[in-house]
Interface confidence: low
């Protein structure tokens, strides 16, 4: 019984098109496939950024595969050919592994990168980003500011930068088409005179990112006794209702402060006959149901009840 | 967590040169330099050198420049230094220290390593 | 090479003091707007810890009440309230230029 052997997938490689972190793992047939013609071969492939505890595996009849990196570290990838055992009469066989690794040589000192990159997605609409210059550049350094997702030919340029003592130190974005749920890829680059200067990569989802405006209309309604309604009504703007979730703060004779969180644009508030003044304010923030995370709203204009019974007016902004 | 490890106390005698590793984990190796300090026993502190470990740069202080000799394992993320034609006055603690750049400091230290030059 | 001095080079304090530790180089250890001085704290038979880099940030972890000041050649390490845990030697050092150097050390003893 000879023993079944298979080799190594060939010219296994990481080849990077620019897209800021996007990357291709490709790679041809391992040599001699003749006597597995009848055969589909597989192959799995393992990779991830230099420094991560763990691989991702893929298992692919393909010659090709792309996924997103953080190209701030190094890749590395592996990959086997795999024999099902319906090929081989037996259990399945796995050639070596081929491997492979893609860097991009870090120019300049870690000082000379730009500090504290901060990206807000205003609304679910205007993408603002903004930096700080290194803490070891001089005042001729410049930035550049180059993102990609897919669905963009190429890495773009931002167009629109925000500017102080003549650098760029942020970059407003133009309308960002079918941006959402997908990898955003961003590098921040720069140029200088004196020295060279350390880009820095950065990748997140936008709708992760979202600064909602703070609600507006902020009403009271006496329900009975003892208890008020708080209404608000959700600012305008592409974010529907059901992706809110809610924070107010409820201040009752500049004593009592009641905070909660809720889902909905009501939330009903027990009090009693003696209140005599009541002030809330609301905040609002895209929910789990329509992203992984998101920022806080600024609170909302303030709403008072004072010196009238809350059970002959309702309140209007 | 960072972890810097330092190979076991040498004893060696004045002529001999002693090879003392630093094995990284816990972070990019890469990203980062590795700095060596000697501690004299009851002294402060001398800044031997560094070394990149992406690249294998390296910068010594003059006065170990011909005898401290840094080189990288990146393979096993481990920084040796090497030092030759020891002498008494070389016994001392050896530190490695974890560095990102100039301006960032030695943020990480491993446990130093106890060489002693008798005859 | 920079020269790096400190004072005291030692002091005796109690829990609660403030404590002010200071460095002066020799020549200026500020390039590109920063300043290249670090410090660090160290207890016996222990390595060194850093406390503070590029003169007045702090380590990652590291308590608020240490702090640190100056540039070009004069620095200073304050601990706003000394804790028992406190009583160590500092140095500073420059990292500005290769050699780097170190401080003679400051050791903060229990009065």
């Known amino acids: 019984d000879t023993e079944i052997k298979v080799n190594p997938p060939q010219d296994f490689e990481i080849v990077d098109p620019g897209y800021l972190g996007y990357l291709y793992l490709q790679w041809q047939p391992p040599l001699s496939l003749d006597h597995f013609k009848e055969c589909t071969v597989e192959y799995e492939l393992k990779y991830r950024n230099i420094g991560s505890e763990t691989w991702k595996t893929i298992i692919t009849k393909n010659l090709h595969y792309k996924d997103g990196f953080d190209l701030n570290k190094g890749i590395e990838a592996k990959i086997h050919t795999l024999l099902p055992w319906q090929c081989t009469n037996g259990s399945e066989v796995q050639s070596s592994w081929a491997e492979t690794t893609y860097w991009i040589s870090p120019q300049g000192i870690p000082e000379t990168k730009v500090q504290d990159m901060d990206c807000v997605y205003y609304n679910w609409q205007y993408l603002l980003c903004s930096w700080k210059p290194g803490i070891g550049v001089l005042l001729d350094t410049n930035y550049n500011l180059f993102y990609w997702y897919e669905g963009l030919d190429h890495a773009l340029q931002c167009v629109d930068y925000i500017k102080a003592d003549g650098q760029n130190i942020g970059c407003r974005f133009p309308y960002l088409e079918a941006s959402d749920y997908k990898d955003f890829y961003i590098c921040v680059n720069g140029s200088s005179e004196n020295k060279p200067i350390r880009s820095s990569y950065f990748t997140f989802q936008l709708q992760n990112i979202v600064k909602p405006l703070p609600p507006v209309y902020l009403t009271f309604t006496r329900e009975s006794s003892c208890e008020i309604k708080l209404k608000w009504s959700i600012p305008l703007g592409p974010i529907p209702a059901r992706c809110f979730d809610y924070e107010i703060e409820i201040r009752e004779d500049d004593t009592t402060l009641v905070t909660a969180t809720v889902e909905n644009e009501t939330y009903t508030l027990k009090t009693t006959n003696e209140t005599r003044q009541l002030c809330f304010v609301v905040r609002s923030k895209v929910n789990i149901y329509c992203s992984d995370d998101g920022i806080w709203s600024e609170w909302s204009d303030k709403q008072c009840w004072e010196g009238e019974d809350l059970s002959k007016k309702t309140l209007l902004r | 967590q960072v972890q810097l490890v330092q190979s076991g106390a040498e004893v060696v005698k004045p002529g001999a040169s002693v090879k003392l590793s630093c094995k990284a984990s816990?972070?990019?190796?890469?990203?980062?330099?590795m700095n060596w300090v000697k501690q004299a026993p009851g002294q402060g502190l001398e800044w031997i050198g560094r070394i990149d470990a992406y690249a294998g740069e390296t910068h010594y202080n003059q006065k170990f420049k011909d005898r401290a000799t840094l080189t990288v394992d990146k393979s096993t993320s481990t920084v040796y230094m090497e030092l030759s034609s020891l002498r008494s006055e070389d016994t001392a603690v050896y530190y490695c220290?974890?560095?990102?750049?100039?301006?960032?400091?030695?943020?990480?230290w491993g446990q130093g390593t106890l060489v002693t030059v008798s005859s | 090479d920079i020269q790096l001095t400190q004072s005291p080079s030692s002091l005796s304090a109690s829990v609660g003091d403030r404590v002010t530790i200071t460095c002066r180089a020799s020549?200026?250890?500020?390039?590109?707007?920063?300043?290249?001085m670090n410090w660090f704290q160290q207890k016996p038979g222990k390595a060194p810890k850093l406390l503070i880099y590029a003169a007045s940030r702090q380590g990652s972890g590291d308590p608020a009440r240490f702090s640190g000041s100056g540039s070009g050649t004069d620095f200073t390490l304050t601990i706003s309230s000394l804790q028992p845990e406190d009583f160590a030697t500092y140095f500073c050092q420059q990292s500005k230029e290769v050699p780097w150097t170190f401080g003679g050390g400051t050791k903060v003893e229990i009065k």
């Open positions: 020549e200026s250890v500020d390039n590109y707007g920063i300043s290249f």
């Open positions: 816990g972070y990019t190796f890469t990203n980062y330099w």
């Open positions: 220290a974890r560095g990102y750049g100039d301006a960032y400091g030695m943020d990480h």
